[in-house]
């Protein structure tokens, strides 16, 4: 009896694992084995596919074959008993195109109100992703074990911290990888759960802000308690993509080690041009807080996003405010080459009730003022680019008295 060729061959590639599955074409025939050959592009001859010769099952693994994953390959299969079936040719394919990203490895560390997630590719030193290893981004789904309400977090790197969690609470999450450059989305990791720790005695510092004064950066933060010491650390932001690299080291800012105030001042030349992450930690001598949330700090924007300079022309019922380029030390104006939006705060000198105007224009009218009344004005600039989302500090307040009635011309 002639053996029939196997049918419906499926090629599954996950990371560096190459699996073939097929259907027996004749279930009634026993003791049949199956063998594969492969052919590379531009070659006439067929080569025996190691790992897939004389297979008794309907699945084989040819991961040991060292293929160029970007090169097209063709496979063929036949059944064998005393005689052999005709060859069945599988549609040619390029391994890289066909490959799926496997589940990443996930390691969790708990803090009281945060979880640190360490993610690494499921296959270490993968051949398939050798040229794309640093292009992996990850997304995750996290939920409270007790509620099951899921939150999705997209586009994270291989070391990520989730903040604003509840102490002593079990959270579960799963992670998948993506190679956006190749339009590949991976499969989820198994679910990992971890319980956050008991609430720390000392909370981390909050609301960290960087501003520029003269040739210095001023770093400010808020803290709940008095009589504390603080330390500040920084990291090159791009190293977040490379947490396994030996250069991933948080560094000290010397002028911000063991400071006793909720701010520190350090020279601008501490940082070269670039994007950095900053974090702050509090200590009372006995206990230490967890690190604050990390803030992104772009020297190019920070250095030049100075508070606006403005002049006020006073009328009886309004102020005309003319915003000019901010001045750097030496009284030279700074050229801002990105669009800005201005936030103007004004209030009656005798009251704390502030009013706010947001304007793109550099000449602004503050309406509905009372005559012969002292009003104070301060302003700050914001970048309009959502990604940068930077703000200058407020300018010093300028106070002016409105004119007597009927001088609105």
């Amino acid at each position: 009896k002639n053996l029939k060729s196997p049918q419906k061959v499926e090629v599954d590639i996950i990371d560096d694992n190459f699996i073939l599955r097929w259907n027996r074409s004749d279930e009634s025939v026993g003791n049949v084995t199956f063998s594969f050959d492969y052919q590379k592009t531009g070659m006439d001859n067929w080569i025996k596919l190691s790992g897939c010769q004389n297979i008794t099952s309907t699945k084989c693994n040819f991961s040991s074959l060292k293929l160029n994953v970007y090169e097209e390959i063709k496979l063929r299969i036949r059944a064998e008993k005393e005689n052999t079936s005709s060859w069945y040719e599988v549609d040619s394919f390029t391994p890289f195109r066909k490959a799926q990203i496997g589940p990443p490895e996930v390691h969790l560390e708990a803090e009281d109100k945060a979880i640190v997630i360490h993610i690494s590719p499921g296959t270490k030193d993968s051949v398939m992703w050798a040229l794309d290893g640093l292009s992996f981004t990850y997304s995750l789904v996290i939920w409270k074990n007790s509620s099951g309400v899921e939150e999705r977090i997209e586009n994270i790197y291989s070391r990520h911290k989730i903040y604003k969690l509840s102490p002593e609470t079990t959270y579960c999450l799963k992670v998948k990888a993506a190679l956006l450059t190749s339009w590949k989305i991976g499969v989820y990791s198994p679910v990992h759960c971890i319980k956050t720790t008991v609430e720390n005695e000392l909370p981390p510092p909050e609301n960290i802000e960087v501003s520029v004064q003269n040739q210095n950066y001023v770093l400010k933060w808020d803290y709940t308690y008095a009589n504390m010491t603080f330390q500040v650390q920084w990291l090159h932001a791009f190293l977040k993509r490379n947490p396994g690299n030996h250069l991933y080291k948080w560094k000290q800012i010397p002028d911000c080690e063991n400071v006793k105030t909720t701010q520190c001042v350090f020279p601008q030349n501490v940082f070269q041009k670039g994007i950095y992450l900053l974090r702050v930690q509090a200590s009372d001598g006995n206990n230490t807080s967890f690190w604050s949330e990390e803030i992104k700090f772009d020297t190019e924007i920070q250095a030049f996003l100075l508070p606006p300079v403005f002049n006020i022309r006073s009328l009886s019922d309004s102020f005309h405010i003319y915003i000019g380029a901010p001045k750097q030390s030496g009284n030279t104006p700074v050229i801002q080459d990105y669009p800005l939006i201005y936030e103007i705060i004004f209030w009656e000198n005798t009251s704390n009730a502030e009013r706010k105007i947001i304007e793109k224009k550099t000449d602004v009218t503050v309406p509905n003022l009372k005559p012969l009344t002292v009003y104070c004005v301060k302003a700050r600039a914001h970048t309009m680019d959502e990604k940068l989302n930077k703000s200058s500090v407020f300018s010093d307040a300028v106070c002016e008295k409105t004119k007597p009635g009927n001088t609105s011309k």
């Epitope: 050798a130 090159h236 030996h246 250069l247 080291k249 560094k251 010397p254």
Partner: antibody, heavy 117, light 108 residues
Framework: EVQLVQSGAEVKKPGESLKISCKGS????????IAWVRQMPGKGLESMGI????????RYSPSFQGQVTISADKSITTAYLQWSSLKASDTAMYYC??????????WGRGTLVTVSS | EIVLTQSPGTLSLSPGERATLSCRAS???????FAWYQQKPGQAPRLLIY???SRATGIPDRLSGSGSGTDFTLTITRLEPEDFAVYYC?????????FGQGTRLEIK
């Protein structure tokens, strides 16, 4: 000004021990790795290992693991490279270099070690 | 460990000519952690290029670096007498940092 000042040339006999030094100044010593690089006569550069004085993290290159010991004393901003038993094949110029994301951006002038019976 | 292979071993050119030095890695290296150095006889090496393409302080724009993955190139557009030296590539993607064996650039 960033400077790495290395200790002077050494002439030793096989089997003897040796410790050479590299003192960093003009920068925050604990914020940068220090690398040790060997250059045998007429040959190329070989990275032996690196140390991060901030937390004493040490990484040896595979071919130098167990052959040398790298250490640092951050209180005096100095890194060290030592041998417990020198061989003639250790004869070389040894450089220290400051290492960060810009590679090895500052180098010492080198310490020439000669091992001969 | 990652092996870096430089080619050619020796390059003989005249001042004013263009030099192209190649470095191939045995496995993919992040371009963020790739550098080129110059060494002259009796001197310590000097950093030229880091991050595959960024010039170090004081390096003239006649020198440029390019490449990614496993193939990197150092180009010197108009050779000056002071450019004749040995050039090394380096990867620091892994903490087992490695150098290429060097390319000697000599005057023809």
């Amino acid at each position: 000004e960033v400077q790495l000042v290395q200790s002077g040339a050494e002439v030793k006999k096989p089997g003897e021990s040796l410790k050479i030094s590299c003192k960093g100044s003009g920068y925050i010593f604990t914020n940068y790795w220090i690398a040790w690089v060997r250059q045998m006569p007429g040959k190329g550069l070989e990275s032996m290992g690196i140390i991060y004085p901030g937390d004493s993290d040490i990484r040896y290159s595979p071919s130098f693991q167990g052959q040398v010991t790298i250490s640092a004393d951050k209180s005096i901003t100095t890194a060290y490279l030592q041998w417990s038993s020198l061989k003639a094949s250790d004869t070389a110029m040894y450089y220290c270099a400051r290492h960060d994301i810009e590679g090895f951006d500052y180098w010492g002038r080198g310490t020439l070690v000669t091992v001969s019976s | 460990e990652i092996v870096l292979t430089q080619s050619p071993g020796t390059l003989s050119l005249s001042p004013g000519e263009r030099a192209t030095l190649s470095c191939r890695a045995s496995q993919s290296v992040s371009s963020s952690f790739f550098a080129w150095y110059q060494q002259k006889p009796g001197q310590a090496p000097r950093l030229l290029i880091y991050g595959a393409s960024s010039r170090a302080t004081g390096i003239p724009d006649r020198l440029s670096g390019s490449g990614s993955g496993t193939d990197f190139t150092l180009t010197i557009t108009r050779l000056e007498p002071e450019d004749f030296a040995v050039y090394y590539c380096q990867q620091y993607d892994s903490s087992a940092i490695t150098f290429g064996q060097g390319t000697r650039l000599e005057i023809k």
